[in-house]
């Protein structure tokens, strides 16, 4: 799997999950989240050669098409597969509230 | 929706489904499919600006991050959303067989 265990410990050039830290204030302009100040969101990057963790029959066909037509602009793309939630604390007036923000952290990628 | 109805009738520069015809023999090297000789597979292409048919909360956050950090390599990617099957005919000896190849035709795209 193109997950954090594999990708963070390798120098993989193909589609893999990469490290990305997002600061809520600086990078998103969000001031209302109290904790955390930011989080390791990660992102997906890298080419999708034939056959590299391809998602559907279509992406397999497209990768094969790409192999036969190297100059084509049609190619699979490296995108998130498994996403995890992020717990946050924010204040409603003086009262702290805990929420789970769903689909916030990339754990693995795929070629789609 | 970034589907064939919208995308094929517009000059949309952002993420949209584009026309792509795949010839089984020439483009994939497949000689075993009797009918059809090829098919309109289509493909997804175009930038994913903020906010353009974003898939998950993560892709929305990433697009916003990208807006604040224009030079970043972390950005959502235009990939298939709705896929349709393709019926084919092939021969087993002299006996024709009809099969549905699932997830072969792109009907719409999304930014993931």
């Amino acid at each position: 799997a193109l997950d954090t265990n594999y990708c963070f410990s390798s120098t993989e050039k193909n589609c893999c999950v990469r490290q990305l830290y997002i600061d809520f204030r600086k990078d998103l302009g969000w001031k209302w989240i109290h904790e955390p100040k930011g989080y390791h969101a990660n992102f997906c990057l890298g080419p999708c050669p034939y056959i590299w963790s391809l998602d559907t029959q279509y992406s397999k066909v497209l990768a094969l098409y790409n192999q036969h037509n190297p100059g084509a602009s049609a190619a699979p793309c490296c995108v998130p597969q498994a996403l995890e939630p992020l717990p946050i604390v924010y204040y409603v007036g003086r009262k702290p509230k805990v929420e789970q923000l769903s689909n916030m952290i990339v754990r693995s990628c795929k070629c789609s | 929706a970034l589907d064939t109805n919208y995308c094929f009738s517009s000059t949309e520069k952002n993420c949209c489904v584009r026309q792509l015809y795949i010839d089984f023999r020439k483009d994939l090297g497949w000689k075993w499919i009797h009918e059809p000789k090829g098919y309109h597979a289509n493909f997804c292409l175009g930038p994913c600006p903020y906010i353009w048919s974003l898939d998950t909360q993560y892709s929305k956050v990433l697009a916003l991050y990208n807006q604040h950090n224009p030079g970043a390599s972390a950005a959502p990617c235009c990939v298939p959303q709705a896929l349709e099957p393709l019926p084919i005919v092939y021969y087993v000896g002299r006996k024709p067989k009809v099969e549905q190849l699932s997830n072969m035709i792109v009907r719409s795209c999304k930014c993931s």
């Epitope: 969000w30 209302w32 007036g93 003086r94 | 929305k60």
Partner: antibody, heavy 121, light 107 residues
Framework: EVQLVQSGAEVKKPGASVKVSCKTS????????MNWVRQAPGAGLDWMGQ????????NYNEMFEGRVTLTADTSTSTAYMELSSLRAGDIAVYYC??????????????WGQGTLVTVSS | DIVMTQTPPSLSVSPRETASISCRAS??????????MHWYLQKPGQSPQLLIY???NLESGVSDRFSGSGSGTDFTLRISRVEANDTGVYYC?????????FGQGTK
């Protein structure tokens, strides 16, 4: 230009529900708190609650808890306020108003034009 | 809940004079070095518009004839060189405590 455009006036019977929409444009709808405020005829302003559209997080004024439901459709950048079990005391102009952005509870920098809800048998 | 009391309930001011409106909170609305108090004007037949943010910060696009001051429980909105266009109902609002609350208005 930031705009909040609300749905038209409503006349409802006591005990019924009303759903008011607030279509936004000119800003990133899903990442700002959207508040709902009501104003009874000749009266002041009452905060009803708020929603953060990206995750559907809500905070309600206990005065309305159980009767008001806030929702948002990020695909159309539209917020909704539904008020149930309507009574004569709910006759008011209902406003959607964007939160300033620094806090969950905050000042409100852009307001819709208001939607008059009348309750009459 | 924090109760906001505005005085006076109504005010008549001649053009070019200065108007002052007071807002008293039932408890302090100061936290983390900020005063969580804001001021709005609702002109006849219109929606409220934000004038002053965090007690003394002039909202973008608002005339500098408007100014806000105060901390803790006592706040003041001043309008210098009053114009006919300033006619309406002025509201204070606190967001230090849930639920967010408004004053009853000064006409």
């Amino acid at each position: 230009e930031v705009q909040l455009v609300q749905s038209g006036a409503e006349v409802k019977k006591p005990g019924a529900s009303v759903k008011v929409s607030c279509k936004t444009s000119g800003y990133t709808f899903m990442f700002y708190w959207m508040n709902w405020v009501r104003q009874a005829p000749g009266a002041g302003l009452d905060w009803m609650g708020q929603i953060f559209p990206a995750w559907g997080m809500t905070n309600y004024n206990e005065m309305f808890e159980g009767r008001v439901t806030l929702t948002a459709d990020t695909s159309t950048s539209t917020a909704y306020m539904e008020l149930s079990s309507l009574r004569a005391g709910d006759i008011a102009v209902y406003y959607c108003a964007r939160g300033y952005g620094n806090y969950a509870l905050d000042a409100m920098d852009y307001w819709g034009q208001g939607t008059l809800v009348t309750v009459s048998s | 809940d924090i109760v906001m009391t505005q005085t006076p309930p109504s005010l008549s001011v001649s053009p070019r004079e200065t108007a002052s409106i007071s807002c008293r909170a039932s408890e302090s609305v100061d936290s983390y070095g900020n005063s969580f108090m804001h001021w709005y004007l609702q002109k006849p037949g219109q929606s409220p518009q934000l004038l002053i943010y965090l007690a003394s910060n002039l909202e973008s696009g608002v005339s500098d004839r408007f100014s806000g001051s105060g901390s803790g429980t006592d706040f003041t909105l001043r309008i210098s060189r009053v114009e006919a266009n300033d006619t309406g109902v002025y509201y204070c609002q606190q967001n230090d405590e849930d639920p967010l609350s408004f004053g009853q208005g000064t006409k």
